[in-house]
């Protein structure tokens, strides 16, 4: 493949037609971007700054406290899964505003626009993960008082991480950059050419493993949590519980315009209208999802303004009270009072 | 009507330069790439790259980059292409041909005649 | 880059008997604008090569509509409903929607 470092004129207004006007010279002079660009690009911009900020910080507050309390590391794991797929938003950002240009090169192609799959998988297995210690504290409370171990639950992130890598790979693969004739723009996307099939086959692993079989599964865990939490009317707060089902609520309401979009190319002609409407839609779509990457910091503040009436402590330790509070007595050998709110109603704590 | 007309045969030494010209008339030379394209005996078709005269901006083939070099002038509605370092696989017959950008066929449409290049010691 | 592979690569047919010419793209040739610029030209002994079909279907001005092109992606066919003596030559397949711009080996179209 030949190597971008030319200058690309702009003839993005000739993006969806073949035909030029004859009275419109073909000229360099920029062009305005579509709507739902203008729109992706504003959530990009924000999502950066909320997402890079707010992570840092949340892992900043859950790492010193990673060592003995649980629920710090599975609040670190997730905010380093968004303060990932938040750096690649500057690129993904200059590409858009480029017209879908892609001036920086193959290996980036393959890596960057991969990083929010691998957070939507990370993300989901790591909620998945979280959402079975919820279950089990409510439901196997002696269990969890002698197994239930900071050793586990890194066990527990490292499958969550190894598994997400797995399935990000077939996105990493077919990655490509395609440099197009006219207008002369390098193009970042992916390319299953003759295997139509493999395509839908990709498309509907990541709808069922990524958002179907974990919404089902989730959904079935927090009816019977709620249930028993409900049914014992548990006096103590459940805010861990509350944040866990917030961080999941949206975990689904934003991946769910890229499931339909995604599932709905792989199985339409490419140069359908159909399909190239929802190409069209595809960087607002992805901007969407990538809310997903600052929306945990939000609901953690969110949050701790609720349990505390009103903001009255410093963001970092209002954070430290929602994602450090602990559920059960003896979590580890390194128990300390400073971890939990209250050592009452410790099976009910969820 | 469309015509692009090159120049005549070259025969060269090989490490030398060859410098082909096409003139072009019947359309608005400005508003088109021209691409050149050449024919090794017997062989396919290679595309080597193309310029648009309106602006000089060009894109070569990464096979020939560094060895081709593709000018116009527009005053003349006149399209160059150079090759150096000759070598004896540089043998063939170059075609100019346009992409015309106000049309809506999208693709070369028109080829020169062609200019045969013969690489010999 | 993309590689156009074209079969079969010589092709006897007996005048007013129709012929058949497959071409198959390594890459989708489909444009970000829906597009497919896939074309089929006819290099006529001695001389350059004349389109003939352009973005897959569409006859070229002048082109007899004996000549017809179809296909989608990766796959494209060049049909001719009935042979004549002036249509002996070299058939290409070619693509303007990736640079570098690609050819098929050629087609040579001979009469039985």
């Known amino acids: 493949m030949d190597s971008f470092n030319y200058t690309t004129p702009d003839y993005g207004h000739y993006d969806d037609k073949d035909t030029l006007d004859l009275n419109t010279p073909v000229d360099k002079t920029s062009n305005t971007l579509r709507v739902p660009d203008i729109l992706a690009l504003v959530i990009f911009a924000v999502v950066f700054l909320v997402g890079v900020l707010g992570n840092a910080l949340v892992v900043w507050v859950t790492a010193f406290e990673a060592k003995r309390t649980i629920n710090a590391i599975w609040f670190l794991n997730l905010a380093v899964a968004d303060f990932l797929s938040c750096l690649a938003l500057p690129i993904l950002f200059t590409s858009i505003v480029q017209h879908h240009h892609w001036p920086f090169g193959g290996a980036a192609c393959s890596i960057l626009p991969s990083l929010i799959l691998l957070n939507m998988y990370a993300s989901i297995l790591l909620l998945a993960t979280i959402s079975a210690d919820r279950f089990l504290l409510v439901f196997k409370p002696i269990w969890c008082q002698n197994f239930r171990g900071a050793g586990l639950a890194w066990i527990a992130c490292a499958v969550a991480w190894g598994l997400a890598l797995l399935l990000t790979i077939p996105s990493f693969l077919y990655r490509v950059v395609r440099e197009e004739y006219f207008p002369p723009k390098v193009l970042c996307g992916v390319d299953y050419s003759h295997d139509k099939r493999r395509e839908r086959a990709v498309a509907i692993v990541r709808l069922v493993l990524g958002f179907l079989w974990p919404l089902l599964t989730l959904t079935i865990c927090y009816t019977f949590i709620l249930l028993r939490t409900w049914s014992r009317r548990a006096t103590r707060s459940t805010k861990t519980l509350k944040v866990v089902v917030a961080v999941v609520a949206s975990f689904f309401i934003f991946w769910l315009p890229y499931q339909v979009t995604g599932i709905m190319m792989s199985f339409l002609e490419p140069s359908s209208p159909t399909f190239l409407l929802l190409k069209k839609l595809d960087s607002l779509c992805v901007s969407f999802a990538y809310i997903n990457c600052c929306i945990n910091p939000i609901i953690y503040v969110v949050a701790g303004q609720g349990f505390q009436g009103r903001l009255r402590k410093s963001l970092p330790s209002l954070l430290r009270n929602v994602l450090t509070e602990e559920s059960v007595v003896r979590e580890s050998k390194s128990f300390t009072r400073s971890t939990v709110d209250t050592m009452a109603q410790k099976t009910q704590a969820v | 009507q469309v015509q692009l007309v090159q120049s005549g045969a070259e025969v060269k030494k090989p490490g030398a330069s060859v410098k082909i010209s096409c003139k072009a008339s019947?359309?608005?030379?400005?508003?088109?790439?021209m691409n050149w394209v050449r024919q090794a005996p017997g062989k396919g078709l290679e595309w080597m790259g193309r310029?648009?005269?309106?602006?000089?901006?060009?894109k070569y083939n990464g096979k020939f980059k560094g060895r081709v070099t593709i000018t116009a002038d527009e005053s003349t509605s006149t399209a160059y292409m150079e090759l150096s370092s000759l070598r004896s696989e540089d043998s063939a017959v170059y075609f100019c041909?346009?992409?015309?950008?106000?049309?809506?066929?999208?693709?070369?449409?028109?080829w020169g005649q062609g200019t045969t290049v013969t690489v010999s010691s | 880059d993309v590689v156009m592979t074209q079969t079969p690569l010589s092709l006897p047919v007996t005048l007013g008997q129709p012929a058949s010419i497959s071409c198959r793209s390594s890459?989708?040739?489909?444009?970000?604008?829906?597009?497919?610029?896939l074309h089929w030209c006819l290099q006529k002994p001695g001389q350059s090569p004349q389109l003939l079909i352009y973005?897959?279907?569409n006859r070229f001005s002048g082109v007899p509509d004996r000549f017809s092109g179809s296909g989608s992606g990766t796959d494209f066919t060049l049909k001719i409903s009935r042979v004549e003596a002036e249509d002996v030559g070299v058939y290409y397949c070619?693509?303007?929607?990736?640079?570098?711009?690609?050819f098929g080996q050629g087609t040579k179209l001979e009469i039985k």
């Open positions: 041909a346009r992409f015309l950008l106000i049309s809506t066929v999208t693709a070369v449409d028109y």
């Open positions: 019947g359309y608005a030379f400005s508003n088109s790439w």
């Open positions: 310029i648009y005269p309106g602006d000089g901006d060009t």
């Open positions: 890459q989708s040739l489909v444009h970000s604008n829906g597009n497919t610029y």
């Open positions: 973005k897959v279907s």
């Open positions: 070619s693509q303007s929607t990736l640079v570098p711009l690609t």
